[in-house]
């Protein structure tokens, strides 16, 4: 509508007791520039005077006639654009209307505009993403509908009370669409946060506190799981028992389904919390977890290594090099699952044991023609000594010897 | 039984080249297992092993004398040979040989039998 | 090059046992340096007593014994007598090359 003036700027401003209030203001007269500007408090219409009633909180008249409160309240506007306003201190009773009384040589103008002040400092308000989810970086944001040039404030993040280490981005706004303070924060929660307390702080420029809010954190995340077993060492020999024990520390949401694996592997039938191995051979050795599930997705718990300890089985040599030249060196290296490993070797060449010779690598630094034959070896760990394997043959190749002509 | 001798010059000057000789019985270089090796001992030292030879033509020497070894045999002499090119005061010493052998039955070699040595004195 | 340590001196009496050791600069001995020991008697007298860390030569004594002790070649005398006082060398191969140790006199305390 041409006849109207048109003004821009918040439409409510926020503030507390003893603070200020900025208001970032734009008009455009009807015509010609301003000539009278009056800041009512809670402005009334008298019919009967045609004029308004009310606080007059400034005044800038041809006349020059200024109110008492002109010290407080500062007009920083000018005859055809601005009409920003401060306030300084802001009081308790400020709250209401406030009215700018616009007149130009031949056109007048009521614009309100609202202010809510407080009796002490507001609580800012954090607002936090829809769903959070462990280790998914999110953005905590923590919003105060205040600024205000005159008095300098500062919001500070808290974890459980204690200051987040993470850098936060305070920005504000003093703008004619809005007034705020805000401050963003960064942050990767662990499943360890879910239920803890975040605090935003409105603090003023000397870090005294003003205000606050809270939220609890809900972070969503795989089941966290303990796996105990018995023995505690996870350390058996074949034909003993072994429990293990899958405990639940945190789920959120709720878990759905339990799995056990060994090395990587389902194991099929084992879908409680308890995995009971009975009589245990040596194939059963392996790293074991188990596997909960809830909407999230799987958590796993750490592995737990079961030995089943036995005796050596029968022994196996490998040579390098057969068939050796005379004169070169030759390894044999004596081969024996066990656990725990072999401490002990005895070593035989074509049945006759070799004095001295109790490491799983035998070297002969120069091989001769008598040490061809067959080299093989007894292995011994804690629970006893292995078989003799069928061993393996030497063949030593070498010049001719003691030519003798026929 | 075995027995090894050595012989050599007793004594020469600085820059020349020692010529040590080791002549033996009771063995053969010809047969298996068996080596020669030269061994020094400076007066009131400990002992510096310096090369040995093998009845295969394998030869080993001290790493930081190498430059200036050389062994031979002759095995139809019994005799293994040590030469050392530009000696110098601190090549006197008493110049062993010891056979190296890998006995009949065994794995290792062993330095089981030794010459009395002989003295070799460089001066100028 | 590597440097073989051993102990300068040591006394037992007869019928005791005595322990050399022989220590390598460039960490543990083991049995690829086939540790050698060779006994010095009086008058430059050498004998070949052990040969691949605990291989006796043929005719040594028994009471000789080779062995690795931790990270060292050692030489057990089980029962010492008067005429095994002597100076022990020990030798240790380095893949190609032998180095020999200071040596270790042995008095027999009679």
């Known amino acids: 509508d041409s006849s109207k003036w048109v003004f821009e700027h918040p439409e409510t401003l926020y503030a507390w007791e003893g603070a200020c209030v900025w208001i970032p203001c734009t008009y455009r007269a009807l015509d010609g520039d301003l000539e009278s500007f009056i800041l009512f408090h809670n402005p009334e219409y008298n019919k009967n005077t045609s004029k308004f009633d009310g606080t007059r909180l400034y005044e800038s008249t041809k006349d020059g006639k200024v109110p008492s409160e002109q010290k407080r309240v500062q007009f920083l506007g000018d005859k055809n654009k601005n009409c920003t306003l401060s306030i300084h201190p802001v009081h308790l009773n400020d709250s209401g209307q406030l009215g700018l009384r616009m007149e130009s040589k031949t056109e007048k103008w009521m614009e309100r505009i609202h202010l809510n002040v407080s009796e002490r400092p507001f609580p800012p308000h954090i607002q936090l993403p829809p769903e959070i989810q462990e280790s998914q970086e999110v953005t905590l944001t923590c919003l105060l509908n205040f600024s205000c040039y005159g008095y300098p404030i500062q919001l500070q993040w808290l974890l459980e009370g204690v200051p987040m280490r993470q850098a936060a981005v305070t920005s504000t706004s003093l703008t004619i669409k809005s007034v705020f303070t805000r401050s963003e924060l960064k942050f990767s929660p662990q499943w360890s946060h879910h239920g803890k307390i975040v605090t935003c702080q409105l603090q003023d420029a000397d870090g005294k506190f003003l205000s606050n809010d809270t939220v609890q954190l809900n972070v969503k995340h795989t089941p966290k799981l303990e796996i105990k077993v018995t023995p505690s060492d996870a350390i058996v020999r074949e034909g003993d028992s072994v429990t293990m024990t899958c405990e639940v520390s945190s789920s959120n949401p709720e878990y759905t389904t339990v799995s056990w694996l060994k090395d990587g592997t389902s194991l099929k039938k084992q879908n409680t919390f308890t995995l009971n191995l009975r009589e245990v051979t040596k194939d059963q050795s392996g790293k074991y977890c188990c596997q909960v599930s809830n909407d999230v997705g799987p958590g796993r718990s750490e592995e737990v290594f079961l030995q089943v300890q036995y005796a050596p089985e029968p022994s196996t040599v490998q040579i390098l090099h057969s068939p050796a030249v005379e004169g070169s060196q030759v390894e044999f290296l004596c081969m024996s699952l066990a656990n725990p490993l072999p401490t002990n070797y005895t070593w035989y060449h074509n049945g006759k044991e070799m004095q001295g010779r109790t490491e799983e690598k035998v070297h002969i630094p120069k091989i001769l023609p008598w040490h061809a034959g067959t080299y093989s070896c007894v292995a011994e760990n804690i629970l006893g000594t292995g078989q003799r394997g069928p061993g393996a043959e030497l063949d030593v190749q070498y010049p001719p010897k003691k030519v003798t002509t026929v | 039984q075995v027995t090894l001798k050595e012989s050599g010059p007793g004594i020469l000057q600085p820059s020349q080249t020692l010529s040590l000789t080791c002549s033996f019985s009771?063995?053969?270089?010809?047969?298996?297992?068996?080596?020669v090796g030269w061994i020094r001992q400076p007066s009131g030292k400990g002992l510096e092993w310096l090369a040995h030879?093998?009845?295969?033509?394998?030869?080993y020497y001290n790493p930081a004398l190498k430059s200036r070894l050389t062994i031979s045999k002759d095995t139809s002499k019994n005799q293994v040979f040590l030469k050392i090119a530009n000696v110098d005061t601190a090549d006197t010493a008493t110049y062993y040989c010891a056979r190296i052998s890998i006995p009949y039955g065994y794995y290792d070699w062993f330095f089981d039998v030794w010459g009395t040595g002989t003295t070799v004195t460089v001066s100028a | 090059q590597a440097v073989v340590t051993q102990e300068s001196a040591l006394t037992t009496s007869p019928g005791e046992t005595v322990t050399l050791t022989c220590r390598s600069s460039?960490?543990?001995?083991?049995?690829?340096?086939?540790a050698n020991w060779v006994q010095e008697k009086p008058d430059h007298l050498f004998t070949g007593l052990i040969g691949g860390t605990n291989n006796r030569a043929p005719g040594v004594p028994a009471r000789f014994s080779g062995s690795l002790i931790g990270d060292k070649a050692a030489l057990t005398i089980t029962g010492a007598q008067t005429e095994d006082e002597a100076i022990y060398f020990c030798a240790l191969w380095y893949s190609n090359h032998f180095i020999f140790g200071s040596g270790t006199k042995v008095t027999v305390l009679g």
């Open positions: 460039t960490g543990a001995v083991t049995t690829r340096n086939y």
């Open positions: 030879i093998w009845w295969d033509d394998d030869e």
């Open positions: 009771g063995f053969s270089l010809s047969t298996s297992g068996m080596g």
